[in-house]
Interface confidence: low
Amino acid sequence: MAFSGSQAPYLSPAVPFSGTIQGGLQDGLQITVNGTVLSSSGTRFAVNFQTGFSGNDIAFHFNPRFEDGGYVVCNTRQNGSWGPEERKTHMPFQKGMPFDLCFLVQSSDFKVMVNGILFVQYFHRVPFHRVDTISVNGSVQLSYISFQNPRTVPVQPAFSTVPFSQPVCFPPRPRGRRQKPPGVWPANPAPITQTVIHTVQSAPGQMFSTPAIPPMMYPHPAYPMPFITTILGGLYPSKSILLSGTVLPSAQRFHINLCSGNHIAFHLNPRFDENAVVRNTQIDNSWGSEERSLPRKMPFVRGQSFSVWILCEAHCLKVAVDGQHLFEYYHRLRNLPTINRLEVGGDIQLTHVQT
C-alpha cells in the first residue's frame, strides 16, 4: 500500500471559503465538495480552483446560476480578466437541496460529477499545476470538502463492490488530545491510514477501465442494495465513514449498520413511517434500548439526496447529516477494531461510500 499525502478534509467550512490544496492540483486528484444549496434569495454559487487567495487567477470557475431557467457557467480568469464563458444549460442543482459535487483533475481537463453523474468536462486553458487554492462562495452551505489522491491501488472486491483504496494522511494523533479543525466536530487527527472509495461494477465481472483513476468520477449504476463492505482495520478513534445517496420517493425505512461479527454495534435506522431516526445496538440477536432524540426535525426527506458522516471517537460515534451534527451514540460494543463491516439497506439509492 503506497501511502501518499492526501490532505485532511475541510469540515463544514463557513462560506465564503478559501482553503489551500496541499501540493496543488495533480493529474488524478479528486476533490469532493458536499453541501446544500441555500433556499434563500441568492441565485448563484461558485467553486473556484485558483492561484493564491486574490481571485485574480482562477484556472476553473464553476458557477451554477439559478437564473433564466438555470444554467452553469464555466470560465477561466487570468490576471483579473475573464475569458469566454462555457455555458451548460442544464441545472443539476436544486435550491434547498443537498449535493455531492466531484471534480476530477486530468491531464487535459476537469471532469465534474454532480450526485454521481458526469455533468461537464472543462478543458484546461492554463496549466492546472499552478492551482493551489480552492474557494467557494455564494448561496451554498458546505458540509465538507475532501481530497482523494491520484495514486490508488485496487483491492479485492468485497461482495459485489469494487473498492479502490484511497490513502489519506493525517497528522499523528497527539496523545491525549482531541484538536479542533474547522468543522462540525473536533475530529481526532488520525494516524496514517487508508480510506476506501467504493464503486460498483459497471457490468458483471468487469471493473472500470482504469484503476488508477478515482472510480467515483465515472457514471455508474446505483449501488447494489443491500450494500455490504468491509471496513479495513475496523473502527478506531478518528475513523470517519462517509455515505451519500438519495432517499426513494416512496421510502418507508433504511438502515446503516456497523457490524462486529454477528453483532450490530451501531444501527442507524431512519423511519419515514414514524418520522424518527432510531439508533440501537444488537448483541447476540438481542436489541438494546432505542435512542430517538434529535436536536431538530427529521433531516432525511423522501426523494431527496443526503450525506451521512459518521465519526468514531473514543467514547462515542458522532453522526452528522448534510454537514450538521445530529447526535452522538455512545459505544455499547467497545471493541472498536472488530467493528469492521458496513451494511446499508432499505429504501435508498447510494451514490458514494467512503470507508
Partner: antibody
Framework: EVQLVESGGGLVQPGGSLRLSCAAS????????IHWVRQAPGKGLEWVAA????????DYADSVKGRFTISADTSKNTAYLQMNSLRAEDTAVYYC??????????WGQGTLVTVSS | DIQMTQSPSSLSASVGDRVTITCRAS??????VAWYQQKPGKAPKLLIY???SLYSGVPSRFSGSRSGTDFTLTISSLQPEDFATYYC?????????FGQGTKVEIK
C-alpha cells in the same frame, strides 16, 4: 452485579512507586473503558487516566503524564495504574470507574495513596 | 485542556427547595457532560449523562439541561438525602475534566 475493587494503595516516600489494581466483575470487561479518578483530601475530583481496553488507547492528565502508566489485562478483568516518581501532591483517594456508553456509571470504593517522607 | 467552571462552590438550602447548579465549559463540548453526586467517604454516583439524560434509578427530581456551553443541574425539590457535593464532568475531550464541585448544605 457490577463491581470494581481497587487495591494497592498505601504509604510511599516521594520519588517512590506504587501499582494500583482495579478488579472488575459482573460485566464484559473488554467492552468498556476504565478510568482512574483521584480526590485529594478535602478537594474535588481529578481525572487521571483512561484505557479503552478493546483498542489499547490510553490518555493521561497533564499532571501525571510521563509518570503514570495505565494498563489492562482483559484475561484477568483487571486494570492497573503504575505510579512512578510519586510526589506529595499525588496523595489522594484513587477511584477506578467503568465508562459505559453513558458515562462513568460504576465506581470502586477507592484506595488511599499517601506520599510522605 | 477544557476547563469546567462550576458555580456556586457551595450553597445552603432547605428541604423542598429548588436548587440549580451551573457549569460552564471553556469551549464547546457538545452534550458530552455528566453530573455526579458524592457523599463524604463514598464514591461518586452518576446522575445525568449526555447533559440531560437521567441515569437509571436516579429520582426524577434531578434534571440536566444545556444551553451552548452552559450546563445546569436542577433538583426540583430538595430531599434530605440530596445533601452532598455535586460535580460536572466533560467527556468531549480525551482529557476528561471535572468541575470544582458544589457542596449543597442544609440551611
Amino acid at each position: 452485579e457490577v463491581q470494581l475493587v481497587e487495591s494497592g494503595g498505601g504509604l510511599v516516600q516521594p520519588g517512590g512507586s506504587l501499582r494500583l489494581s482495579c478488579a472488575a466483575s459482573g460485566f464484559t470487561f473488554s467492552r468498556y473503558a476504565i478510568h482512574w479518578v483521584r480526590q485529594a483530601p478535602g478537594k474535588g475530583l481529578e481525572w487521571v487516566a483512561a484505557i479503552y481496553s478493546p483498542t489499547g488507547y490510553t490518555d493521561y492528565a497533564d499532571s501525571v503524564k510521563g509518570r503514570f502508566t495505565i494498563s489492562a489485562d482483559t484475561s484477568k478483568n483487571t486494570a492497573y495504574l503504575q505510579m512512578n516518581s510519586l510526589r506529595a501532591e499525588d496523595t489522594a483517594v484513587y477511584y477506578c470507574a467503568r465508562e459505559g456508553y453513558i458515562g462513568m456509571d460504576y465506581w470502586g470504593q477507592g484506595t488511599l495513596v499517601t506520599v510522605s517522607s | 485542556d477544557i476547563q469546567m467552571t462550576q458555580s456556586p462552590s457551595s450553597l445552603s438550602a432547605s428541604v423542598g427547595d429548588r436548587v440549580t447548579i451551573t457549569c460552564r465549559a471553556s469551549q464547546s463540548v457538545s452534550s458530552a457532560v455528566a453530573w455526579y453526586q458524592q457523599k463524604p467517604g463514598k464514591a461518586p454516583k452518576l446522575l445525568i449523562y449526555s447533559a440531560s439524560s437521567l441515569y437509571s434509578g436516579v429520582p426524577s427530581r434531578f434534571s440536566g439541561s444545556r444551553s451552548g456551553t452552559d450546563f445546569t443541574l436542577t433538583i426540583s425539590s430538595l430531599q434530605p438525602e440530596d445533601f452532598a457535593t455535586y460535580y460536572c464532568q466533560q467527556s468531549y475531550s480525551a482529557l476528561y475534566t471535572f468541575g470544582q464541585g458544589t457542596k449543597v448544605e442544609i440551611k
